[in-house]
């Protein structure tokens, strides 16, 4: 049960062409479905059904993005095309450097992601819920450019840097 510290940077462009950045921190967990390591990339929101598509050429993004998937209540998708683990694999196959699942509506997904996998993905698969998930989805839903940095330990506070 390793905590994943996620830093999300939102880039807002101003009329003058400059960028303003907003940074927000949230916590999730590394699942056993993936590796417990740091990752960083531009956020790409993926619909759970979008990952069903077998034609990988159709929406192959440039490598190194972070996929964000909001899982729906199991009742709304009683016969999913892929398991949650399958969705994570599909995202990584398509070039994701990490996948973040919002499991707020689907707590059972946590068990699926944490089932002892003999062949875990080599990239991190993180899950978030509650207030952290709301924070993340609020940023993702703005449909602006945003980057996620996933870390294994908390980002250092400015006061924690030592003056050598």
């Amino acid at each position: 049960k390793e905590t994943a510290f996620v830093e999300v940077v939102l880039f807002e462009s101003s009329p003058s062409g400059d960028y303003t950045t907003y940074t927000t921190g949230l916590t999730g967990r590394f699942s056993r479905a993936g590796a417990t390591l740091s990752a960083e990339g531009e956020i790409v929101q993926m619909h759970p059904l979008g990952l069903c598509n077998n034609n990988d050429e159709e929406d192959l993004y440039e490598y190194g993005w972070v996929g964000v998937v909001k899982l729906e209540q199991p009742e709304l998708d009683p016969k999913p095309c892929l398991t949650v683990l399958g969705k994570a694999k599909r995202a990584v196959q398509r070039g994701a450097t990490a996948v973040i699942f919002d499991v707020s509506e689907n707590p059972e997904a946590i068990d699926q992601l944490n089932q002892g996998s003999e062949d875990p993905l080599k990239r991190p698969v993180v899950y978030v819920k509650g207030a952290d998930a709301i924070k993340l989805m609020n940023i993702v839903n703005k449909q602006k450019v945003a980057r996620a940095r996933i870390q294994h330990r908390p980002p250092r506070q400015p006061t924690e840097y030592f003056d050598m």
Partner: antibody, heavy 116, light 110 residues
Framework: QSVEESGGRLVTPGTPLTLTCTVS????????MGWVRQAPGKGLEWIGI?????TTYYASWAKGRFTISETSTTVDLKITSPTTEDTATYFC?????????????WGPGTLVTVSS | AYDMTQTPASVEVAVGGTVTIKCQAS??????LNWYQQKRGQPPKLLIY???TLASGVPSRFSGSGSGTEFTLTISGVQCDDAATYYC????????????FGGGTEVVVK
């Protein structure tokens, strides 16, 4: 690292009251802070939580009755229009830095008595 | 809306005995369940988080189990110092909540 509540006193019904939670040894920008109350002889009742000064969540019964706000070193709880049912010890607590949403660090509490 | 129901409300146990407290969530909360101990006149103290992980400094006679909607706190080899009220708390959601805490269980040690 510590948190301490203050501002609890005897107030008459309808008189707004603000409780203050003063923290030391850690930064509020890194932690969410919650308020919990306990009426005499009763159980713990969650009021709400504030995340890094900008996002607040309240128990459904507490919306409109309480306001949580934050400065750099304090977290305030305003009881907008106290009633006798608001008589309780009010605790401020720091949420853990993982996502267990447990409350790891608690203040000793401050007693609010609402009576005419 | 993730209501937490704790049973029993009160339990009496002899020194050295075992006490079991149950907590039920109205919806699945995975393993996001925390337990607290509160002694009279003191603030609550975190005992167990994530359903089964002991908080720092908590004796091993305390243990927690469960997942989904059913959870249990067990105190084995009860000591006089364990006389307190115990509360469960869901750590799943902060929205549309009446109370994240269960109603509490008073443990009386004979």
């Amino acid at each position: 690292q510590s948190v301490e509540e203050s501002g609890g006193r005897l107030v008459t019904p309808g008189t707004p009251l603000t409780l203050t939670c003063t923290v030391s040894g850690f930064s509020l920008s890194s932690y969410a802070m919650g308020w919990v109350r306990q009426a005499p002889g009763k159980g713990l009742e969650w009021i709400g939580i504030i995340y890094a000064g900008d996002t607040t969540y309240y128990a459904s019964w507490a919306k409109g009755r309480f306001t949580i706000s934050e400065t750099s070193t304090t977290v305030d709880l305003k009881i907008t229009s106290p009633t006798t049912e608001d008589t309780a010890t009010y605790f401020c607590a720091r949420k853990s830095d993982d996502d267990s949403d447990s409350y790891l660090l608690w203040g000793p509490g401050t007693l609010v008595t609402v009576s005419s | 809306a993730y209501d937490m129901t704790q049973t029993p409300a009160s339990v009496e146990v002899a020194v050295g005995g075992t006490v079991t407290i149950k907590c039920q969530a109205s919806q699945s909360i995975s393993s996001y369940l925390n337990w607290y101990q509160q002694k009279r006149g003191q603030p609550p103290k975190l005992l167990i988080y994530d359903a089964s992980t002991l908080a720092s400094g908590v004796p091993s006679r305390f243990s927690g189990s469960g997942s989904g909607t059913e959870f249990t706190l067990t105190i084995s080899g009860v000591q006089c110092d364990d006389a307190a009220t115990y509360y469960c708390q869901q750590g799943w959601s902060s929205t549309n909540i009446d109370n994240i805490f269960g109603g509490g269980t008073e443990v009386v040690v004979k």
